[in-house]
């Protein structure tokens, strides 16, 4: 008799999830020699232990503590780049500007980027059919709790000037419900962080508006100021040129506004 299985609203665990996590761990520790002390088998065991045999709507940050401990990593606290709804450009930027880091440039972020996972209560199986959706099912699911945990720790580690890349093409340039708006903003430490600098990325070629005046950016400024952190904002009118100028800062066309 086939066992009854909970049907969730979200996509199931990414296929070959264990193999993918292991392979990513090996690759990451290979190209980051300072992390070669990490035992990827132990990392996978801790990752698995956070959600296997647990109800996928009952996951806590505590469940991920063994993994957090194994993945402890020091990144330069003044070189942190946060992002919201503009992941690809943020990653392209840190691939060029090698001394800056997004969460996905750290081991734990790299392991889980773009993956989905969940288990089932009281069985050691991984659920490849469906996983809880944050809105339709529950917020305390394995994926959401993981990103909340690592995002909080990442923001807490930041110091000096923290940069955030925001998508100027969206109706809410700053969204209070995003991971940045709901977790990272509130976990920047005022005693360590002097300024949050927002880079608003323009979508249209002819868009010359000052998106730093957008109401949602003003809302972000207000939240940040209330936390005793200074706020500044820059428009990035030409993201393609912006990246090009990060690659080749000596280029004569890079002195004008981008």
């Amino acid at each position: 008799v086939p066992r009854w299985r909970q049907q969730w609203s979200g996509p199931g665990t990414t296929k070959r999830f264990p193999e993918t996590v292991l392979a990513r761990c090996v690759k990451y520790t290979e190209i980051h020699p300072e992390m070669r002390h990490v035992d990827c088998q132990s990392v996978w065991d801790a990752f698995k232990g956070a959600f296997i045999s647990k109800h996928p709507c009952n996951i806590t940050e505590e469940d991920y503590q063994p993994l957090m401990k194994l993945g402890t990593q020091t990144v330069p606290c003044n070189k942190i780049l946060l992002w919201s709804r503009i992941k690809d450009l943020a990653h392209q930027f840190t691939q060029v500007q090698r001394d800056m880091f997004t969460l996905e440039d750290t081991l734990l972020g790299y392991l889980a980027d773009d993956l989905t996972w969940c288990g089932e209560f009281n069985t050691s199986k991984i659920n490849y059919q469906s996983c809880p959706d944050w809105r339709k099912d529950c917020s305390n699911n394995p994926v959401s709790v993981f990103w909340k945990t690592v995002s909080r720790r990442f923001a807490e580690a930041a110091c000096d000037v923290v940069h955030v890349m925001l998508n100027g093409s969206r109706s809410k340039i700053f969204d209070k419900n995003s991971t940045f708006g709901s977790v990272e903003v509130h976990n920047l430490q005022p005693e360590k962080v002097q300024t949050l600098e927002a880079w608003v990325i323009h979508g249209g070629r002819e868009d010359s508006r000052d998106l730093c005046q957008d109401p949602t950016i003003k809302e972000l400024e207000s939240i940040i100021s209330k936390r005793n952190i200074q706020f500044s904002c820059k428009n990035i009118y030409r993201p393609d040129k912006f990246l090009q100028c990060v690659k080749n800062p000596e280029d004569s066309s890079c002195t004008s506004e981008i």
Partner: antibody, heavy 116, light 108 residues
């Protein structure tokens, strides 16, 4: 501290095979990766191939494909490299290194002399 | 495969001087996956720099790396007696991983 200790020097006849061992200690073995790099007398460095035990994956340089075999013994944390159909141009110091592409720890090297 | 060409072949300098070693790739090295190694006579090489500019554990800060794409540089700000050796660059962005032919830094 990671240590890679290699087997001793060998003298081989052309056409024969050589198997060099490398005992690893001081770090996670199964999820580490290992490669072999050779250096002919007075020459530069040449990557031959690598292995990632936990993934069961090997990657060999085209030049050595068909002649090289890299395996590991997890029970003794030892990496082996076998090179067959030896010729005089294979005379070199063979280094066991940690890493499949970027090499942060090196063994002391094993001199293999191919001579009739 | 990516061919790495190092220049000069030999660099004759005195202790205390600055050494600048060049490594040029035949095609762009992805993600600046370029390393530098030092090798002294009768010894195995040791990793100095990875990711074009990150110093490996225990490497003194007189060693620095820079560059991206196809042009990379290793700089030794003030040569110490123990720095006279052969230096190799290596790319690990595209298999097969390849090394330059080496630059010998010798005492003038």
């Amino acid at each position: 501290q990671v240590q890679l200790v290699q087997s001793g020097a060998e003298v081989k006849k052309p056409g024969s095979s050589v198997k060099v061992s490398c005992k690893a200690s001081g770090g996670p073995f199964r999820s580490s990766s290992f490669s072999w790099v050779r250096q002919a007398p007075g020459q530069g460095l040449e990557w031959m191939g690598g292995i990632i035990p936990i993934l069961g994956k090997t990657n060999y340089a085209q030049k050595f494909q068909g002649r090289i075999t890299i395996v590991t013994d997890e029970s003794t944390t030892t990496v082996y490299m076998e090179l067959s159909s030896l010729r005089s141009e294979d005379t070199a110091v063979f280094y066991c290194v940690r890493g499949s592409s970027l090499f942060d720890y090196w063994g002391q090297g094993t001199l293999v002399t191919v001579s009739s | 495969e990516i061919v790495l060409t190092q220049s000069p072949g030999t660099l004759s300098l005195s202790p205390g001087e600055r050494a600048t070693l060049s490594c040029r790739a035949s095609q762009s090295v992805s993600s600046s996956y370029l390393a530098w190694y030092q090798q002294k006579p009768g010894q195995a090489p040791r990793l100095l720099i990875y990711g074009a500019s990150s110093r490996a554990t225990g490497i003194p800060d007189r060693f620095s790396g820079s560059g991206s794409g196809t042009d990379f540089t290793l700089t030794i700000s003030r040569l110490e007696p123990e720095d006279f050796a052969v230096y190799y660059c290596q790319q690990y962005g595209s298999s097969p991983w390849t090394f330059g032919q080496g630059t010998k830094v010798e005492i003038k």
